[in-house]
């Protein structure tokens, strides 16, 4: 009786049980009575991840220099080319289709994580006691200057994008 | 069990064409590959391209590229070899056979070509 | 693709061991386990005896065996039968959906 389910890494064609293509193969030939499933190995630039009877193999990805992409990791036959960007640019997906520039945080945030080719930059508003005076994809925010530690006072109050201003103390007269 | 019956003898004339055609039967016409395979009488066997009848994607032999087109229609389950330009050396017997591997053949077609 | 080195002619007795090679390069024999050989009788189409190298067609007698090693496969047909007289031919796939054929070898049973 002929088969109506067939084992994992095989499939069903003509009433019989026929081997699925390994990955890095493609499918030239179903299984017969007499021979097995003709595969054949996918060529430069091609690729097939999976146990298939696809009679194509997929193109390997292209990092497009244009887009601000490079290749983060090349494809063989079984796997696909993995982009990521030029330094200083990130992913827009994770496809990692197009880059664009990291995001800088304007005076009063500082980073919280610095970007990856991934991932953009996060920034975090500069709490009380701590200030951020530039705009920048890589600087935290700093705290305000001790005044008391340089024997010193507060002339002026820091700010979120200010640091405080020390000055002598007053004499006692 | 895949079966492939070609098309008549031909007999042609230099500079013409002639177009060969392969006629399966049994299993599924759009899951294997077909073949072209010639043989000059008293001459060993030659690849000259294949077809997927899936896609109708076509990869020829370098000796043959520009001269020789495959194609198929998957409503008769029939592919067809035209050769082009066709000279006196380019009689043989042409067989379609099923994948690479070409483990069926149909039974030969012979291509004379004379003046 | 130049066509894969098989030598024009072999021969032995009944019952013999007859071994024929089929050398090719470093881009298709070497490089792939896709060789294949077909006995071809006077008059017939060709017929598959080995594929991917070394398995055996359903229905193919084992004494027909194949193996490969570097740039050279090779076919032995052991037990000699006359039905064994006929030509040999191997292919090989050579990448990028081409295949090429050797020569082929005629084999005589002597006797």
């Known amino acids: 009786e002929p088969p109506t389910a067939c084992r994992e890494k095989q499939y069903l064609i003509n009433s019989q049980c026929c081997s699925l293509c390994q990955p890095g193969q493609k499918l030239v030939s179903d299984c017969t009575e007499f021979t097995e499933t003709e595969c054949l190995p996918c060529g430069e630039s091609e690729f097939l991840d999976t146990w298939n009877r696809e009679t194509h193999c997929h193109q390997h990805k292209y990092c497009d220099p244009n887009l601000g992409l490079r290749v983060q990791q090349k494809g063989t036959s079984e796997t696909d080319t993995i982009c990521t960007c030029e330094e200083g640019w990130h992913c827009t997906s994770e496809a990692c289709e197009s880059c664009v520039l990291h995001r800088s945080c304007s005076p009063g945030f500082g980073v919280k994580q610095i970007a990856t080719g991934v991932s953009d930059t996060i920034c975090e508003p500069c709490p009380v006691g701590f200030f951020s005076n530039v705009s920048s994809a890589f600087e935290k925010c700093h705290p305000w200057t001790s005044c008391e530690t340089k024997d010193l006072v507060v002339q002026q109050a820091g700010t979120n994008k200010t640091d405080v201003v020390c000055g002598p103390q007053d004499r006692l007269r | 069990q895949v079966q492939l019956v070609q098309s008549g003898a031909e007999v042609k004339k230099p500079g013409s064409s002639v177009k060969v055609s392969c006629k399966a039967s049994g299993g599924t016409f759009s899951s294997y590959a077909i073949s072209w395979v010639r043989q000059a009488p008293g001459q060993g066997l030659e690849w000259m391209g294949m077809?997927?009848?899936?896609?109708?994607?076509?990869s020829y032999a370098q000796k043959f590229q520009g001269r020789v087109t495959m194609t198929r229609d998957t409503s008769t389950s029939t592919v067809y070899m035209e050769l082009s330009s066709l000279r006196p050396e380019d009689t043989a017997v042409y067989y379609c056979?099923?994948?690479?591997?070409?483990?069926?053949w149909g039974q030969g077609t012979l291509v004379t070509v004379s003046s | 693709q130049s066509a894969l080195t098989q030598p024009p002619s072999a021969s032995g007795s009944p019952g013999q061991s007859v071994t024929i090679s089929c050398t090719g390069t470093?881009?298709?024999?070497?490089?792939?386990?896709?060789v294949s050989w077909y006995q071809q009788h006077p008059g017939n189409a060709p017929k598959l005896i080995i594929y991917d190298t070394r398995k055996r067609p359903s229905g193919i007698p084992d004494r027909f065996s194949a193996s490969k090693s570097g740039n050279t496969a090779s076919l032995t047909v052991s037990g000699l039968q006359a039905d064994d007289e006929a030509d040999y031919y191997c292919s090989s796939y050579a990448g990028n959906n081409n295949l090429v054929f050797g020569g082929g070898t005629k084999l005589t049973v002597l006797g």
């Open positions: 470093s881009s298709d024999v070497g490089a792939y386990n896709f």
């Open positions: 056979a099923r994948g690479f591997r070409m483990d069926q």
């Open positions: 077809i997927n009848p899936s896609g109708g994607t076509t």
